[in-house]
């Protein structure tokens, strides 16, 4: 008996061939001997089966001695043994229809679990192997689970169902809902405008939800909500914003926030959360702001940074085109009695400058100028 595997919702063509290459009488029946379809001369006739609206054949193939049974929009319950009767012969074909579906939605939040469930006909014992877009293989029986989805799991999952040494392949598109970056850091000189961007790592037709940016300033004892907003069909509208700082928000995606001025009291870490409609859980992106200030008070030239800096960052003060006068893994450095000239305050990581502020030190009789 020939075995054919089919996919739920697909079309399958069960073949039946006669030795004579001409149109002769044939008919297809199911295992209960109920006629599905056949011919009377060049007429295509259909029997009383439940497949009536989905069963077809192709007259153009009859003249070649081929009498296919085509079943459209396959259902699991179409799994059966089909018998083609032609030239006093019976050809049996066992059709097994499988379905593979994602447990819930195919749009899942980062960190959530994906469960794939195999629908299979009674009496079958299939095995399933799925390959994720990043090449990770998972195997299972009726269900396959992947916990803690990552951004790289977005894309087409290819699953192979094996039964009776035959295989059928399913492709499921999974979208992991996340921000492009889990964390970002912005380095700014005091007084500069700050731009925070929160690009999403996915695109959907309609995007609706609400979000909030909580901010923990380095100098503050507790965090506070800086802004809350709504997202409707990719349009952003601000619901509430603090008076200090007075953030501005872009009306379109990607989510974009502007802080008019970088000030030491704003340096710190923020957490932007986005709750999407019809989704449990939230998307998160951490954002950090480091602010630098260079000042000269009397005979003391000071450079300070505020905000979350790593211990390996180096803060230096140097006179332009000269070696660093002072260089420390600290958040403040200073030079007493600095000589006149353009001084540079540099925040660097392994030799790469992250932030630079210049201050002009005038001869001792005049006040300093900050360019």
């Amino acid at each position: 008996k020939k075995v054919v595997l089919g996919k739920k919702g697909d079309t399958v063509e069960l073949t039946c061939t006669a030795s004579q290459k001409k149109s002769i009488q044939f008919h297809w029946k199911n295992s209960n001997q109920i006629k599905i379809l056949g011919n009377q001369g060049s007429f295509l006739t259909k029997g009383p089966s439940k497949l009536n609206d989905r069963a077809d054949s192709r007259r153009s193939l009859w003249d070649q001695g081929n009498f296919p049974l085509i079943i459209k929009n396959l259902k699991i319950e179409d799994s059966d043994t089909y018998i083609c009767e032609v030239e006093d012969q019976k050809e049996e074909v066992q059709l097994l229809v499988f379905g593979l579906t994602a447990n819930s939605d195919t749009h899942l939040l980062q960190g959530q679990s994906l469960t794939l469930t195999l629908e299979s006909p009674p009496g079958s014992s299939p095995s399933v192997q799925c390959r994720s877009p990043r090449g990770k293989n998972i195997q299972g029986g009726k269900t396959l689970s992947v916990s803690q989805l990552e951004l790289q799991d977005s894309g087409t999952w290819t699953c192979t169902v094996l039964q009776n040494q035959k295989k059928v392949e399913f492709k499921i598109d999974i979208v992991v809902l996340a921000f492009q970056k889990a964390s970002s850091i912005v380095y700014k000189k005091e007084g500069e405008q700050v731009e925070f961007s929160f690009p999403l790592a996915f695109t959907v037709e309609k995007l609706t939800g609400s979000g909030e940016l909580w901010w923990q300033a380095e100098r503050a004892s507790s965090s506070k909500s800086w802004i809350t907003f709504d997202l409707k069909n990719k349009e952003v509208s601000v619901k509430r914003v603090t008076q200090d700082p007075k953030l501005q928000m872009g009306k379109k995606l990607p989510l974009h926030l502007t802080l008019p001025q970088a000030l030491p009291q704003y340096a710190g870490s923020g957490n932007l959360t986005l709750a999407l409609e019809a989704k449990t859980g939230k998307l998160h992106q951490e954002v950090n702001l480091v602010v630098m200030r260079a000042t000269q008070l009397q005979k003391n030239l000071t450079c300070e940074v505020w905000g979350p800096t790593s211990p390996k960052l180096m803060l230096s003060l140097k006179l332009e085109n000269k070696e660093a006068k002072v260089s420390k893994r600290e958040k403040a450095v200073w030079v007493l009695n600095p000589e006149a000239g353009m001084w540079q305050c540099l925040l660097s990581d392994s030799g790469q400058v992250l932030l630079e502020s210049n201050i002009k030190v005038l001869p001792t009789w005049s006040t300093p100028v900050q360019p």
Epitope: G41, F43, L44, T45, K46, G47, A55, D56, S60, K72
Partner: antibody, heavy 122, light 107 residues
């Protein structure tokens, strides 16, 4: 002379059902299958399904499955097409057509009804 | 389902012109193809079946050809009564499909 005479125009509200009749005369009713074909205003022809008047077996186009029912009454040589859950896009002229058996393998249409206009409007 | 594509979708011609309308099937349908003519407010009329056989009562200026996926309907010398919409139809599959139609207008 074969004739297919259809019932008159209908106006229906969205969500309602319509039942159109097609009475055959001048031929052996049970010898020919009857198909229903519709045509929306300014649009092309769309096959809906077929009924075999002898055994009453039906086959419907996938688009209409679950919404269309074709039946026949051999005593009056009449076939019926009922379409349920009507929506505005079902506004069309509905034709019954005889699938001739002399050629076309019973699947092209030599005789047509005059058409029934079904308007779906709230 | 088998898709049927007609070209052109509309065409202007004069009385006496030779006109050709083409129909393409999305898969091989051998010669299981019919052509119909429809005039405004009227039911379609069968012209040709089995790709090339003229239905009884149809004038001989109409002819059909083709096999497999490509088919043509030709009107050798247009008459005033030929201005109408023409449809092709496949019946290789039991799920019948029509082309979208070709409107033939007077130039």
């Amino acid at each position: 002379q074969v004739q297919l005479v259809q019932s008159g125009a209908e106006v229906k509200k969205p969500g309602a059902s319509v039942k159109v009749s097609c009475k055959a005369s001048g031929g052996t009713f049970s010898s020919y299958a009857i198909s229903w074909v519709r045509q929306a205003p300014g649009q092309g022809l769309e096959w809906m399904g077929i009924i075999n008047p002898s055994g009453g077996s039906t086959s419907y186009a996938q688009k209409f499955q679950g919404r269309v029912t074709m039946t026949r009454d051999t005593s009056t040589s009449t076939v019926y097409m009922e379409l349920s859950s009507l929506r505005s896009e079902d506004t069309a002229v509905y034709y019954c057509a005889r699938a001739t058996g002399l050629y076309c393998s019973g699947s092209c249409f030599d005789y047509w009804g005059q058409g029934t206009l079904v308007t779906v409007s709230s | 389902d088998i898709q049927m594509t007609q070209s052109p979708s509309s065409l202007s011609a004069s009385v006496g012109d030779r006109v050709t309308i083409t129909c393409r099937a999305s898969q091989d349908i051998s010669n299981y193809l019919a052509w119909y003519q429809q005039k405004p407010g009227k039911a379609p009329k069968l012209l040709i079946y089995a790709a090339s056989i003229l239905h009884s009562g149809v004038p001989s200026r109409f002819s059909g050809s083709g096999s497999g996926t490509d088919f043509t309907l030709t009107i050798s010398s247009l008459q005033p009564e030929d201005f109408a919409t023409y449809y092709c139809q496949q019946y290789d599959s039991s799920f019948i499909t029509f082309g979208q139609g070709t409107r033939l207008e007077i130039k």
